[in-house]
């Protein structure tokens, strides 16, 4: 006695016709409506009467469109695990996390669980850049020509190399890539390690 | 608080057309799990199940008057319509609309129509 | 279509006596979705009983339910004055048509 437009409606083969917003109800055999995102299943659906939904209480949360009897409930990002809050959880959305600064995810389980202090990159290197932060641990390369890094640091980056030029001086020892370029006045004398060099 | 009252002609003439208004207030027919019903009782009779109008725009009959009985929501204006076609002098009765949907202390949904209107009692009569 | 009977169709007891109506299906049902009503002359019907057995805030816990299937049972552990009605059963498994009603009367 219930028109076709709307759930319930009678499902021989046990499939219905859009399975993201409903499901299959095998007790009575028929299609009934998934609750949307936020809500949860009040009261399962009847031969007469579709799914009630309700919205989840605080501190709760159904992600996806579904026929829970519960909501999940939020949890914070621990602290302790590393992690930190970049987002609060919603009545649609479980609290997002991430790893705090200077920390990597070292444990994966559908999102982070654990996260550890990333590697230090040695001198003259500097940490390859990632698409996302956090996501794995430092991969440390080589300061590219004409730059220098001279910390043990899992965050310092390779800097260019100062031009004396610019500064109105002149090179007194070249940069490395561990070093920067070592300038000095143009009138000053040279170094007396390099006095002899000067004369010849 | 709920309220549902009823209202609209008191005498009909047969083979004319009923139409029923039920006006509430205290619930909307958009909140999941809504429903409203219409009911009749003719006079020192029982009670008879007429149509129900759910929050989804699911419409049930009873099966002995379905083809003469529509039922319809204006969510927007918390009323419901019944109409019924070809009236005869059996239908003279007490019509009544109701809520349905009962939420319990624990906020658990139950079936059930938990508030009633008052009731119009409609004549059908030459 | 799911037909509901009550008996007797009359009930005449005394004040302080115990009360038990019946409400057979003919065919079975999901229990939960049974509810009984009271309904005193001139007003309209009053919720009493929902799933079969539970009661709504306010009705008194001499008032209760239970069955299941396609037997359900009214009971008014001692019927006061204001209990002498007319109780309706009514099914919400397919359709929602109710039984014929049991009058309570006083004896």
């Known amino acids: 006695s219930q028109p076709q437009a709307v759930p319930p409606y009678a499902s021989e083969n046990q499939t219905c016709r859009d399975q993201e917003k409903e499901y299959y109800e095998p007790q009575h055999r028929i299609c009934c409506s998934r609750c949307p995102p936020g809500t949860y299943v009040s009261a399962k659906c009847s031969r007469i009467r579709d799914t009630v939904c309700a919205t989840c209480a605080e501190n709760s949360y159904n992600e996806h469109w579904n026929y829970l009897t519960i909501c999940q409930l939020c949890r914070p990002c621990d602290p302790v695990m590393g992690l930190e809050e970049i987002a609060p959880c919603t009545s649609k959305r479980k609290t997002q996390c991430r790893c705090q600064p200077g920390m990597f995810c070292a444990a994966w389980a559908l999102e982070c669980t654990h996260c550890e202090l990333l590697s230090d990159c040695p001198p003259g290197t500097e940490a390859e850049l990632k698409d996302e932060v956090g996501k794995g641990n430092n991969h440390c390369v080589p300061c590219k020509a004409g730059h220098f890094q001279n910390t043990s640091s899992p965050s310092a980056r390779c800097q260019p190399h100062t031009r004396c030029e610019n500064q109105g001086l002149v090179e007194a020892a070249p940069g490395t890539a561990q070093s920067d370029t070592t300038c000095k006045n143009p009138l000053e004398p040279l170094p007396p390690e390099m006095s002899g060099t000067m004369l010849m | 608080q709920i309220t549902l009252k009823e209202s609209g002609p008191t005498l009909v003439k047969p083979t004319q057309t009923l139409t029923l208004t039920c006006t509430f207030t205290?619930?909307?027919?958009?909140?999941?799990?809504?429903?409203v019903g219409w009911i009749r009782q003719p006079p020192g009779k029982a009670l008879e199940w007429l149509a129900l109008i759910y929050w989804n725009g699911g419409k049930l009959y009873s099966p002995s008057l379905k083809n003469r009985l529509t039922i319809t929501k204006d969510t927007s204006k918390n009323q419901v319509v019944l109409t019924m076609t070809n009236m005869d002098p059996v239908d003279t009765a007490t019509y009544y609309c109701?809520?349905?949907?009962?939420?319990?202390?624990?906020?658990?949904?139950?079936?059930?129509?938990?508030?009633w209107g008052q009731g119009t009692t409609v004549t059908v009569s030459p | 279509e799911i037909v509901l009977t009550q008996s007797p169709v009359t009930l005449s007891l005394s004040p302080g006596e115990r009360a038990t109506l019946s409400c057979r299906a003919s065919?079975?049902?999901?229990?939960?979705?049974l509810v009984w009503y009271q309904q005193k002359p001139g007003q309209a019907p009053r919720l009493l009983i929902y799933g079969a057995s539970s009661r709504p805030t306010g009705i008194p816990d001499r008032f209760s339910g239970s069955g299941s299937g396609t037997d359900f049972t009214l009971t008014i552990s001692r019927l006061e004055p204001e209990d002498f009605a007319v109780y309706y059963c009514q099914q919400y498994d397919t359709s929602l048509n109710f039984g014929g009603g049991t009058k309570v009367e006083i004896k």
């Open positions: 205290g619930f909307s027919l958009s909140t999941s799990g809504m429903g």
């Open positions: 065919q079975s049902l999901i229990s939960d979705y």
């Open positions: 109701a809520h349905s949907g009962y939420y319990d202390n624990s906020g658990y949904y139950w079936d059930g129509m938990d508030v």
